[in-house]
């Protein structure tokens, strides 16, 4: 005897159409796109009934139910506003991901996405993955360089990406982006195995206030071109957080250098150094302290630390050095892995030009300069450990 | 936010019948596509579904333990109510309720250890 | 009730790509499910339908199915997915779960 005649379920249609199903035949259901099948309260990935012997169907007729995406992901620094409706997230509803303002900034799409038939939250260019807020980077309180003095005070939100690394020294390092830190690798080598050990705070110009923003390490690089005790060439390292930090006014990463940086780092062109090392009166600065110098001319520095006790081929093509002929002006032991800043007036952002490394014996004197590594060589070697890792 | 925990006794003597009980925060068992599943884990072993209900009343059972076992739910206090009768040494497991939407198990209780014995 | 057959074990080192696989008569024309398990707590969905992330979860989780077998990929593996993972689907109203698979990440 033949079966009842299937009736599609709203949303639906029957295949294949027939004027009657006898003993073995069969229909499918298939849905209208943004609506899926459902048996009971199961979504069912396809449907198909069998008339049997006895005139049933050997299964229940399914339900066509509106597709729905669910809620949205979390969007790290950033949120979710809901554009259809309150809560709307079924077939065709649209969200608006946007980041957090001042501090963030979208990268990958415009933010907007569309609950599409297969039941994923989708960006104009055909994207299922969630937008990336990015810190922004380069943000300071302070608006020009320029003038050179010397053993200033900092003010809140001058050095926001500055990094105090305790660990055997002091020492101290830059923020990149919301989970790295760029500092020396003369002043992490001995943690090079141990990065638990160090001891990273951030968002604090006093080096001794309890009121700070505790990092710790998960692993440190040292770059691979270093040799601890043979000179400074290839001073440079980065420290992987083992979390992101919240960027706010007072901890917000430095900017790398652009190609076009070293139209800003010219002889005589003013960097600004900041650090709680040694001042003129030999101890550890309590509060953050910087001093705007003026980059040397290479050859000058060269020559500079061609005499004894220095061993010829100290400074290097990885290096660049700041400073006054007059002396006075200098970072010192404490400052080490440090930020040397410049202002790309093209950008309004400050950008990391060096990272404190080595000088004289005896810090800010005469005829002598900071000796710092040299960035803008090393953005290849950062971007791969940064993708890599 | 969703929750779910179970409660009932952690031992029950063979051929007692076990009752637990699953309440629920955070959605309803009375709208929606949700439903409310029970599961099961002996010590060191793999999980094991044994029966759910859905909002609309909709009732399903483990086949090998259909006869053993009655799931129901009161929409008024939030709870979800298994009984597994003539309970034996080897039901001895953690019991699991879980609400399930979409089709996926999305949010367990803690669980609770039940252990039968003399 | 029918059996769903994953490997008791998998072993895989940090960074690289883990696959887990769940095979059943005829799986492919079922949603199939991921549930992750770590020692002395709730298992926890890490796919659905197939192939789709429960919101929470990162995107090196993904699923595929096809034929009679289910996978589950973890792509740049951490330390943090040890654990013991369980894939499931149902047959008529009923569920039925895998029988388990133990991912070690090596040191």
């Known amino acids: 005897q033949p079966c009842p005649y299937p009736m599609a379920p709203p949303n639906g249609h029957v295949s294949p159409v027939q004027a009657k199903y006898i003993l073995k035949d069969s229909f499918s259901i298939f849905c209208e796109t943004g609506y899926e099948l459902l048996q009971g309260h199961l979504p069912l990935k396809s449907f198909t009934a069998v008339c049997q012997k006895d005139g049933s169907w050997d299964r229940p007729m399914p339900a066509c139910s509106i597709v729905d995406c669910g809620p949205p992901d979390d969007l790290p620094s950033g949120r979710v506003e809901y554009i259809t409706g309150p809560g709307v997230t079924t077939y065709k509803a649209v969200i608006q991901y946007s980041c957090e303002e001042t501090f963030y900034t979208m990268k990958v799409n415009d933010g907007k996405y569309v609950c599409e038939a297969d039941g994923f939250w989708t960006s104009s260019k055909g994207e299922k993955s969630l937008p990336v807020c990015e810190p922004v980077c380069g943000l300071s309180a302070r608006t020009t360089g320029g003038r050179i003095y010397g053993g200033q005070k900092a003010k809140p939100g001058d050095f926001p990406w500055q990094v105090l690394i305790l660990g055997g020294t002091t020492a101290a390092g830059a923020l990149l982006y919301d989970n790295w830190v760029l500092t020396a690798a003369h002043a992490v080598y001995e943690q090079k195995h141990d990065a638990s050990a160090l001891d990273i705070r951030m968002g604090t110009l006093k080096r001794l206030s309890p009121h700070y923003t505790q990092a710790w390490s998960e692993a440190v690089f040292i770059h691979e071109g270093y040799t601890h005790d043979a000179g400074f060439d290839n001073d440079i390292a980065l420290i992987k957080l083992n979390n992101k930090v919240v960027i706010n006014s007072n901890i917000t990463p430095i900017c790398l250098p652009r190609k076009e940086a070293e139209s800003f780092m010219r002889t005589d062109d003013i960097g600004t150094a900041s650090g709680w090392g040694l001042t003129q009166r030999g101890f550890l600065a309590r509060n953050l302290m910087y001093v705007d110098i003026p980059i040397v001319d290479h050859q000058k520095c060269t020559a500079a630390y061609e005499k004894p006790p220095y061993p010829r081929g100290s400074v290097t093509a990885n290096m660049l050095c700041a400073g006054l002929e007059s002396g006075g002006k200098d970072s010192c032991r404490g400052d080490a892995g440090g930020a040397l800043v410049f202002l790309d007036s093209e950008t309004e952002r400050w950008f990391v030009g060096g990272i404190v490394s080595w000088g004289s014996m005896n810090c800010g004197e005469a005829g002598q300069y900071g000796v710092y590594t040299k960035v803008i060589n090393y953005i290849p070697w950062i971007e791969n450990i940064i993708s890599d890792f | 936010q969703v929750t779910l925990k179970e409660s009932g006794p952690v031992l029950v003597k063979p051929t007692e019948t076990l009752t637990l009980t699953c309440t629920v925060s955070?959605?309803?068992?009375?709208?929606?596509?949700?439903?409310v599943s029970w599961i099961r884990q002996p010590p060191g072993k793999a999980l094991e579904w044994l029966a759910h209900?859905?909002?609309?009343?909709?009732?399903s059972y483990r086949t090998s333990l259909k006869s053993r076992l009655t799931i129901s739910k009161d929409t008024s206090k939030n709870q979800v109510v298994l009984t597994m009768t003539n309970m034996d040494p080897v039901d001895t497991a953690t019991y699991y309720c879980?609400?399930?939407?979409?089709?996926?198990?999305?949010?367990w209780g803690q669980g609770t250890l039940v252990t039968v014995s003399s | 009730q029918p059996v769903l057959t994953q490997p008791p074990s998998v072993s895989v080192s940090p960074g690289q790509t883990a696959s887990i696989t769940c095979s059943g008569d005829?799986?492919?024309?079922?949603?199939a499910y991921w549930y992750q398990q770590k020692p002395g707590h709730s298992p926890v969905l890490v796919i659905y339908?197939?192939?789709k992330r429960p919101s929470g979860i990162p995107g090196r989780f993904s699923g595929s199915n096809s034929g009679n077998t289910a996978t589950l990929t973890i792509s740049g593996t951490q330390a943090m997915d040890e654990a013991d993972y369980y894939c499931?689907?149902?047959?008529?109203?009923?569920?039925?779960f895998g029988t388990g698979t133990k991912v070690t990440v090596l040191a």
């Open positions: 955070g959605f309803s068992l009375s709208r929606g596509k949700m439903g």
């Open positions: 879980a609400r399930i939407r979409a089709g996926g198990i999305d949010y």
């Open positions: 005829k799986l492919g024309d079922k949603f």
């Open positions: 209900i859905f909002s609309s009343d909709e009732k």
């Open positions: 499931q689907a149902w047959d008529s109203s009923t569920a039925v």
């Open positions: 339908q197939d192939n």
